[in-house]
Structures are given as structure tokens and as C-alpha cells.
């Protein structure tokens, strides 16, 4: 589920609209923000869970003790892997999910390795530090709400609101702040 | 000026408002998504520009040509770097500009060196390469409408839609595909 | 100083066997990918196999799949290529060669060589 | 047949320059700087000259250097002597059919 370290802070602007469960079935955006919410699929974090689902479907993941060890990239296999896994400070996409969040699922960056791969052993090495890139994603934060004006919440009635949340998107190697 | 290979593609949903050039000063957003426009404020993208700007009109930026060429990285001055600058990928950043786009301002990453800063000399190696990573940011793009029906564009005036562009938001270092 | 010595070399007919052996000193043997690289007699430089630094990473030439296989041991610091249903096109120059980039053709240390002639 | 190029034969007198030239493709020569240039003196191992396209490992003479254009990476030895005279080769990463390959080899001749 998500990591409350990479929440960002909701900013209410106005009074948001109350939505009871029958008018907005889970999982939807509210229609007033959907028009935008259809382009949430571009967004990276968002087109990258359906790969990885699709993926670990057919089976393709290797088993997680691989996919979370510290790779070494086979010489031949540097010609055609992608970025993530040429990377000396390589990672992994992992789908985070959130069912009070709008996309409820995104592709969060995981580095592999603590250290990096040197490049003249294929090794990994602890002189260098793997860190995680983070970037900011504007996603939609659902919130019970009370709609009878009571300002008591009323059982599954939500309302939406606009935050930016922190979103690791990828690895890069670092000299280490101390040694 | 903004780089067109970074642009996004833009989905309309229904017909957006046409704005006056009274109704909209220049650089600002529409009303109606001002409420959520406020918050774009706290996308890194945006909020790497004021620092940006700010370190440039003290004159803290050094000359140009420092600035764009691949570093040699010195053990001492890693300690209070930041990530961009302890990277063996090294980035600086370019504030973006694009008057028909909000936020117009947006933080642009780019690698220093072609390949990636050996850890053992501190110099560039050719055996490794930096490449950029890239995060998608919701925007709006301006264009030009008509606001008597016409079809022709009204001078002055326009309507908003929402796109997602690729950002580059930092560099890894890769084992190249190819030699 | 820094060195690779390459053994086992001779003379075998086609469809026998060979095991080379290449002995290194003077540098941590394990940390380094090595590479066999052949040349036959009067012809150029042509890539067979590399094995990674632990030694479970190997990798073959086309036209040595599934008759050589390359090993280590880097408690005795030494590297091995065993060849079978060797071929007449199998004569060549037999040299060990250290990488000093594990994924690249940069081979900065190599052995003398060591001959394999396959012949009836 | 080679996947890189190279001339059979050079020559020059001694003192002369000359270089020998390494052709591949874009996707290999092209793409980055990273060809390694070996020297091989009858009877003897190969001798690393040049890496990454243009270093040169400590105690190869700085007569040797290497340069890029294109597709193409070529070796100049300056200032030649009598004990340069061997054969060259260059050599790159090649497919996962063959992982690294070498140029057919120059012959360096000197007058």
C-alpha cells in the first residue's frame, strides 16, 4: 500500500463537492474532473501499471528474491535492456496502490542495489551510493464528507480533493556525503 | 525556449472557454482551474524555478561555460553537494520557458556529461553514459480560438487545455546499449 | 607483477578433446571477467567466451556453442577452456585475456598464448 | 568477415605519422567513443594501446593517440619508429552473436 513518507499534503480550495457511493462507484473519478482524469494515463507513473500487471500475469516477473537482489547485467544483455536495467544504480517498478487515491495505482521506483554496479568488476560497490529521483504528481485525494450539512461523515459519501504527491521515478549514483 | 521533442500531445474534452485578452492576463491561468492551478506552485518543476532565478540575479550562477561542461568531481566538495552535483550523472538546471504554456516556467534537467564521472579519477569515462530521466507534468497549453463563432481566431483570445509533457527531471548512468 | 600464463596446449585430432588452463597473478584474480581469444595461424583476432568475475556468468562465440566450456577457480587463481569435438578451423592461438571493463573489449592484460593444432 | 574494417597494410618512414583507420557502423564505431586499439608483434600477445577511443594505459608511448569521426576510429602514430612495426587492431562490442569483435588487423610496415 502506500508509503505515508511520500504523501503529500492536501489544499482544499472552497467547499468540494459530497459524493454518496451510488452516485460515484469506486475506484471513478468524479465526473467534473474526469475529462482531465482521462489524461492521467499518460502520466508515466500511471502507463507503466499496466506493463508490470500485464507482466506478472504471464508470468514474466522473475520470483521476487531476483527482481529485489542486486542485479549484475550481463554483458550481453546490456545491448538491449532498457534504462532501468542498464543503470549502475539499476532499479524496479513496483505498483503502489491506494483505493482513497485517484489514480488508485501507480509505478513507484525501487533501487536494486544499495551501493552501484562497478563497471570494471560487474560487481556491486559500496564507494557509491544508490538514491532514489523523486518527482511531484498532481493525483486526487478522496476524503469522507458529510451531505446532510451535519459535518458528521456520512457512510460512503467521499469528496475530492487536488494534492501532489512525491513520486520515485527512477535511481541515480551518487558519490557518498561521507565516507 | 521550450524543446519541442519534450512536448506532450493535447486531448480536448468538449469545447474549453474562450478567454479575452481582458478576461486573462497574460501568464496567468483560467479562473476555473486556478483553484487547482494554485497548487502547481509545489511541483518540483515549478518550484526549482524561484531558486533558479533567484541564484542567477545574485549572481551565484558561475559563467556559462562553467556550468555546462561535465565537472570533475572533488572528494570535499561532495559533502554538503546536492544530488544533482554528487551524481557520477551530474545535472544542472534550465529554466524552460513557453509563453503558451502554464506554468510558463518549469525547471528543466540536463546531463553535464556524455559519459559519467569515473569514481576512482573523478574525471569523465567514455565506458559509461548519462542519460536523462523523464517524469510526465500536467499542463495547460494555450492556443488561439474564436470568440464570435466564426471559426477564425479572435486576436488576443484563448482557450486552455490540459496535456502532459516529459520533463527531464534528473540523470542515471548506463552501461551503453552499443559501442 | 601483473601476469597471465596460458598451458595445455598440443597437437589433437578432429572430434577430440583439449583443456587449456591460464594461471594469473599479481592482481585480486576475482574481481576481474576474463575472456579466451583465439587467433589462428596467419588470421586475425576472434573472440570465444568471457566468464564473469564469481564465475557464474559464461558466454560463447557462435562457433564454439555447445562443444567449449569455459570455468574458474579463484581460490587457485586460474581459468580453464575445455574443448571437445574439436575441429581443424578449432587450430589457433589460445590466449587468456583480463577485461578491465566487464562489459567491454577492453583487454588489458593477456597471456603468451598457448597452440592448439587439430589435425589427423 | 569482420564487422570492422580496416586497411591490410600501411607504411611509413621512420619520424613519419601515419594512421590506420577502423570502419563500422552506426551502431557500433558510430555511437560512442569506446574503440580499443591493440598492437601485436610476430610471435608475441596483443598489447592494449588505446581504450575508450582515445586513452591510452600507463606506459603506452604518447606517439600513439586515437580519435573518432563519424563511423569511423582511426589510430596515428607520430614521430614512427622501427619497433612499431607489428600488426593493429581494433576492436569493438559487436551483437549477442558475437559479443566483441575485432577489425581484420592492419599491417604496419616501416620503411
Known amino acids: 500500500h502506500h508509503d505515508p513518507s511520500l504523501r503529500g499534503h492536501p489544499h482544499s480550495h472552497g467547499t468540494p463537492h459530497c459524493y454518496s457511493a451510488e452516485e460515484l462507484p469506486l475506484g471513478q473519478a468524479p465526473p467534473h474532473l474526469l475529462a482531465r482524469g482521462a489524461k492521467w494515463g499518460q502520466a508515466l507513473p500511471v502507463a507503466l501499471v499496466s506493463s508490470l500487471e500485464a507482466a506478472s500475469h504471464r508470468g514474466r516477473h522473475e520470483r521476487p528474491s531476483a527482481t529485489t537482489q542486486c542485479p549484475v547485467l550481463r554483458p550481453e544483455e546490456v545491448l538491449e535492456a532498457d534504462t532501468h536495467q542498464r543503470s549502475i544504480s539499476p532499479w524496479r517498478y513496483r505498483v503502489d496502490t491506494d483505493e482513497d487515491r485517484y489514480p488508485q495505482k501507480l509505478a513507484f521506483a525501487e533501487c536494486l542495489c544499495r551501493g552501484c554496479i562497478d563497471a570494471r568488476t560487474g560487481r556491486e560497490t559500496a564507494a557509491l551510493n544508490s538514491v532514489r529521483l523523486l518527482q511531484s504528481l498532481l493525483v486526487l485525494r478522496r476524503r469522507p464528507c458529510s451531505r446532510d450539512g451535519s459535518g458528521l461523515p456520512t457512510p460512503g459519501a467521499f469528496a475530492f480533493h487536488t494534492e501532489f504527491i512525491h513520486v520515485p521515478v527512477g535511481c541515480t549514483c551518487v558519490l557518498p556525503r561521507s565516507v | 525556449h521550450h524543446d519541442p521533442s519534450l512536448r506532450g500531445h493535447p486531448h480536448s474534452h468538449g469545447t474549453p472557454h474562450c478567454y479575452s485578452a481582458e478576461e486573462l492576463p497574460l501568464g496567468q491561468a483560467p479562473p476555473h482551474l486556478l483553484a487547482r492551478g494554485a497548487k502547481w506552485g509545489q511541483a518540483l518543476p515549478v518550484a526549482l524555478v524561484s531558486s533558479l532565478e533567484a541564484a542567477s540575479h545574485r549572481g551565484r550562477h558561475e559563467r556559462p561555460s562553467a556550468t555546462t561542461q561535465c565537472p570533475v568531481l572533488r572528494p570535499e566538495e561532495v559533502l554538503e553537494a546536492d544530488t544533482h552535483q554528487r551524481s557520477i550523472s551530474p545535472w544542472r538546471y534550465r529554466v524552460d520557458t513557453d509563453e503558451d504554456r502554464y506554468p510558463q516556467k518549469l525547471a528543466f534537467a540536463e546531463c553535464l556529461c556524455r559519459g559519467c564521472i569515473d569514481a576512482r579519477t573523478g574525471r569523465e569515462t567514455a565506458a559509461l553514459n548519462s542519460v536523462r530521466l523523464l517524469q510526465s507534468l500536467l499542463v495547460l497549453r494555450r492556443r488561439p480560438c474564436s470568440r464570435d463563432g466564426s471559426g477564425l481566431p479572435t486576436p488576443g483570445a484563448f482557450a486552455f487545455h490540459t496535456e502532459f509533457i516529459h520533463v527531464p527531471v534528473g540523470c542515471t548512468c548506463v552501461l551503453p546499449r552499443s559501442v | 607483477q601483473v601476469q597471465l600464463v596460458e598451458s595445455g596446449g598440443g597437437l589433437v585430432k578432429p572430434g577430440g578433446s583439449l583443456r587449456l588452463s591460464c594461471a594469473a597473478s599479481?592482481?585480486?584474480?576475482?574481481?576481474?571477467?576474463i575472456s579466451w581469444i583465439r587467433q589462428a595461424p596467419g588470421k586475425g583476432l576472434e573472440w570465444v567466451s568471457y566468464i564473469s568475475s564469481s564465475g557464474s556468468t559464461t558466454y560463447y562465440a557462435e562457433s564454439v556453442k555447445g562443444r567449449f566450456t569455459i570455468s574458474r577457480d579463484n581460490a587457485k587463481n586460474s581459468l580453464y577452456l575445455q574443448m571437445n569435438s574439436l575441429r581443424a578451423e578449432d587450430t589457433a592461438v589460445y590466449y587468456c585475456a583480463r577485461q578491465s571493463y566487464y562489459f567491454l573489449p577492453y583487454f588489458d592484460v593477456w597471456g603468451q598464448g598457448t597452440l592448439v593444432t587439430v589435425s589427423s | 568477415q569482420s564487422a570492422l574494417t580496416q586497411p591490410a597494410s600501411v607504411s611509413g618512414s621512420p619520424g613519419q605519422s601515419i594512421t590506420i583507420s577502423c570502419t563500422g557502423t552506426?551502431?557500433?564505431?558510430?555511437?560512442?567513443?569506446?574503440v580499443s586499439w591493440y598492437q601485436q608483434h610476430p610471435g608475441k600477445a596483443p598489447k592494449l594501446m588505446i581504450y575508450e577511443g582515445s586513452k591510452r594505459p600507463s606506459g603506452v608511448s604518447n606517439r600513439f593517440s586515437g580519435s573518432k569521426s563519424g563511423n569511423t576510429a582511426s589510430l596515428t602514430i607520430s614521430g614512427l619508429q622501427a619497433e612499431d612495426e607489428a600488426d593493429y587492431y581494433c576492436a569493438s562490442r559487436g551483437s549477442r552473436r558475437v559479443l566483441y569483435v575485432f577489425g581484420g588487423g592492419t599491417k604496419l610496415t616501416v620503411l
Open positions: 552506426s551502431s557500433d564505431v558510430g555511437s560512442y567513443n569506446l
Open positions: 599479481g592482481f585480486t584474480f576475482s574481481d576481474h571477467y
